[in-house]
Structures are given as structure tokens and as C-alpha cells.
């Protein structure tokens, strides 16, 4: 197999592919463009199957600077040759290209979550979509970090089956009347840097006398 189409990667665009709420989202930024495009069209082909570039339907003549490719890009192994065209009215301002391998280029954004503090534990409710495509699971692990008074504890809940639907994890054996902060993120089985969620904090309510006496035993 030879993939020797012209190597015309244009440095005028910066692309990023992210797994956001288990959707494949391609976003882009422009460098040094004096005229800002009014709209964009995104096209792609698969390197190993040299066919004509295909327009992504929901990203044709779009004013957004991102595109949801979940239903288009199904393989984590193949190279997707991506071309972004920028327009001002009917005039093509630029065209830039980039090659993506999802297994290498995908970054994993943290899931949405909520926390509720109780006297000596915190309920962490992580929100996953109801259905997640198998190829978008990426052998990911959920990590919940608990921070208090400079001490960080990592929790790696075991999730049975796919990461789909809402998931509740209880961080227990906590100290009443203490401030705790929680962050969640998705970890891949490689050396890649993780993207942690912003911290959510809660001050646990004070315990009853009997409870604190009990915990002192």
C-alpha cells in the first residue's frame, strides 16, 4: 500500500481532535489570516482507500469552527486525510490539510460530573451518554481524584461493561466539617498527559457528637 498523495499540509490551520462526551469532535484555529472566513467546508478521505474527498454533510458551509465526526470516522487505526476549506462569500480564502490517526491523535476530555457532600462521604455522579459506540471506548479508565488539605487520593472505579449511562461513585471514610475537592478525568493506557476537569469542592457538614465519638474509636 502506498499513500503518496501530495504532502501539502498547510501550516495556516491548527487542528485538534477530541473525545468530548464520547463524541469525536474536530476543532480548528486559523493562524495569521487577515480575512476571517464567513464559513467553512470540511472534506476527508481514508488514506488506505484512495477515493475522492468526501464532504462532511453537517460541516458543509458551516460557520462553526468545529465538526462532529462521530458518525463519519469509525476506525481508530486508519489515517483520515482531512481538508478544511475557508470561504468569504463565494471566494475560497484557503485550504489546509492534515492527517489524523484517532489512536494517536485523540485527546480525551473529562466527563461532566456533579458532587453531593454528606457528613462523611461524597457522592460523585459522572454523566456518560446513554449509548457509546464501541470504537470510541479507547480502553479508557475513569479516574476520580479527591483532594483535601494538600493530600490527593486517586480512585479508579471499576466500570462493568461500557462507559455509558450515569455512574455514581461514593468516596467514603471522609472527615466531617472538612473541605474536599474532586476532579475527574479519563486515562488511556499510555504515557499521554491527561486532561483533568476543573475541581468541584464541597464543605462536608459537621458530624453529630455520637458520630465523631464513634469515628474516634
Amino acid at each position: 500500500i502506498s499513500y503518496d498523495s501530495p504532502d501539502y499540509t498547510d501550516e495556516s490551520c491548527t487542528f485538534k481532535i477530541s473525545l468530548r462526551n464520547f463524541r469525536s469532535i474536530l476543532s480548528w484555529e486559523l493562524k495569521n489570516h487577515s480575512i476571517v472566513p464567513t464559513h467553512y467546508t470540511l472534506l476527508y478521505t481514508i488514506m488506505s482507500k484512495p477515493e475522492d474527498l468526501k464532504v462532511v454533510k453537517n460541516c458543509a458551509n458551516t460557520t462553526r469552527s468545529f465538526c462532529d465526526l462521530t458518525d463519519e470516522w469509525r476506525s481508530t487505526h486508519e489515517a483520515y486525510v482531512t481538508v478544511l476549506e475557508g470561504f468569504s462569500g463565494n471566494t475560497t480564502l484557503f485550504s489546509c490539510s492534515h492527517n489524523f490517526w484517532l489512536a494517536i491523535d485523540m485527546s480525551f476530555e473529562p466527563p461532566e460530573f456533579e458532587i453531593v457532600g454528606f457528613t462523611n462521604h461524597i457522592n460523585v455522579m459522572v454523566k456518560f451518554p446513554s449509548i457509546v459506540e464501541e470504537e470510541l471506548q479507547f480502553d479508557l479508565s475513569l479516574v476520580i481524584e479527591e483532594q483535601s488539605e494538600g493530600i490527593v487520593k486517586k480512585h479508579k472505579p471499576e466500570i462493568k461493561g461500557n462507559m455509558s449511562g450515569n455512574f455514581t461513585y461514593i468516596i467514603d471514610k471522609l472527615i466531617p466539617n472538612t473541605n474536599y475537592c474532586v476532579s475527574v478525568y479519563l486515562e488511556h493506557s499510555d504515557e499521554q498527559a491527561v486532561i483533568k476537569s476543573p475541581l468541584k469542592c464541597t464543605l462536608l457538614p459537621p458530624g453529630q457528637e455520637s458520630e465523631s465519638a464513634e469515628s474516634a474509636k
Epitope: S48, H77, A79, N99, F100, E135, H188
Partner: antibody
């Protein structure tokens, strides 16, 4: 024709670092991944990691515990692997190779770079 | 990590005779995209490895058709219908379905 030309062999001291280069020619550099594989003396093959030269994004095996840093320079069509905190265990032949489809194993390989770590 | 187990360790074959190498993986290599990323390499003495077969059974260009790859799931086989002198070396299976990619321990093919 496709060629991956690796830098020459190295004899280095334990605790130091080394940077191995892999210069690609005969094809469009950003259209393929560059993978790195090592072979300890008399042993089998061990996968180190992979880089997309176009994006600079890479993945490395956790088994190497952060020892390898992969980079690529599009302007010179060259991929690099920096190995740090070297020990005698890191003495091996290091290969770079190119892949079009991740996981389908490389179709072209460099000639190998012999690294010897010894005091 | 996925463990790849190759047998036999050494194979001693007369030229013109067939040869067979087995490779078993500790988990299925069928990917969610429907493909199986199981490859076979040959490393001749003093040389870099060379890919022979990818995706279980696809022959690389220039590889003679006396080589065939087969299998699915966790069990795979490389067969050489008639061994020739140039076939000697170490054969490796390599899986690329799961991260990190892993290799079998190798099978040394010797000529009797």
C-alpha cells in the same frame, strides 16, 4: 525509493541520555506514522511507541515508564527518540519504521541503531 | 498487555518441505472496526525485520505466495508451503489491535 536512515551506534554511560534520529526519504513524511521498536541482545522485539509526524502527537508504552520521548521535525523529514536515565537494560538495537495503518505493522524499517550503555 | 505465545521455539525443516508456526494471543484480536490486526514479520540474520503478512492473511508486495496466514480471534498460523533457503531467520507475530502493540517471542526457522 523509500528509505529510513538512522543515526550511528552510541556508547554511553549509565544515567545519561541519548537521542536517536531517523531521516525519512522517498515518500511524503506526514502521510505515515513512525514507530520505534527495540531488540535487546539475543532477544525478541519490543514496541516502544509511535508518532504522527504531522501533528507531533505520540503514544508510548507504559512499560518503558517515561524513558522514551518521541518527536518529529517536518522541515527535515526526521523523527527522533530521546532515551533518558539510561541503564545497562537499555542496551539494544533500536529500529524506526513507518506505518500507514496503525496496528498493521510497518512496511519499511530503518537499519537499526545499536545503543550500548556501559560504565 | 496482550501476551502473544508462539510455538515452536525452533523449527528445523528440509528445503522443499512445508513449515507451520502457531501464534496464540491472550485475548481476542478482533477490533471494533471488524478487522484483526495480526501481522507476521521475518528477521533474517543481521538484518532489520521485514513484514510478510498483515491483517492475518494479506501478503505484502514482493512476498512469495508460498507464505499464507490464517486464523481468527486468538489462534493464528503462518504456513510456508515449500521452504526455501532464503526463508531462514526468526519469524514474529505482532498484534496491533490492543495498546500497547506486542510481539510473540519468535520462532527460529533453521534449514536441515
Amino acid at each position: 525509493q523509500v528509505q529510513l536512515q538512522q543515526s550511528g551506534g552510541e556508547l554511553v554511560r549509565p544515567g545519561t541520555s541519548v537521542k536517536v534520529s531517523c531521516k525519512a526519504s522517498g515518500y511524503a513524511f506526514t502521510n505515515y506514522l513512525i514507530e520505534w521498536i527495540r531488540q535487546r541482545p539475543g532477544q525478541g522485539l519490543e514496541w516502544i511507541g509511535v508518532i504522527n509526524p504531522g501533528s507531533g502527537n505520540s503514544k508510548s508504552s507504559k512499560n518503558l515508564k517515561g524513558k522514551a520521548t518521541l518527536t518529529a521535525d517536518k522541515s527535515s523529514n526526521t523523527a527522533y527518540m530521546q532515551l533518558s536515565s539510561l541503564t545497562s537494560d537499555d542496551s539494544a538495537v533500536y529500529f524506526c519504521a513507518r506505518s500507514g495503518v496503525y496496528g498493521s505493522s510497518p512496511d519499511y524499517w530503518g537499519q537499526g541503531t545499536t545503543l550500548t550503555v556501559s560504565s | 498487555d496482550v501476551v502473544m505465545t508462539q510455538t515452536p521455539l525452533t523449527l528445523s525443516v528440509t528445503i522443499g518441505q512445508p513449515a507451520s508456526i502457531s501464534c496464540k494471543s491472550s485475548q481476542s484480536l478482533l477490533d471494533s472496526d471488524g478487522k484483526t490486526y495480526l501481522n507476521w514479520l521475518l528477521q533474517r540474520p543481521g538484518q532489520s525485520p521485514k513484514r510478510l503478512i498483515y491483517l492475518v492473511s494479506k501478503l505484502d508486495s514482493g512476498v512469495p505466495d508460498r507464505f499464507t496466514g490464517s486464523g481468527s480471534g486468538t489462534d493464528f498460523t503462518l504456513k510456508i508451503s515449500r521452504v526455501e533457503a532464503e526463508d531462514l531467520g526468526v519469524y514474529y507475530c505482532w498484534q496491533g489491535t490492543h495498546f500497547p502493540q506486542t510481539f510473540g517471542g519468535g520462532t527460529k526457522l533453521e534449514i536441515k
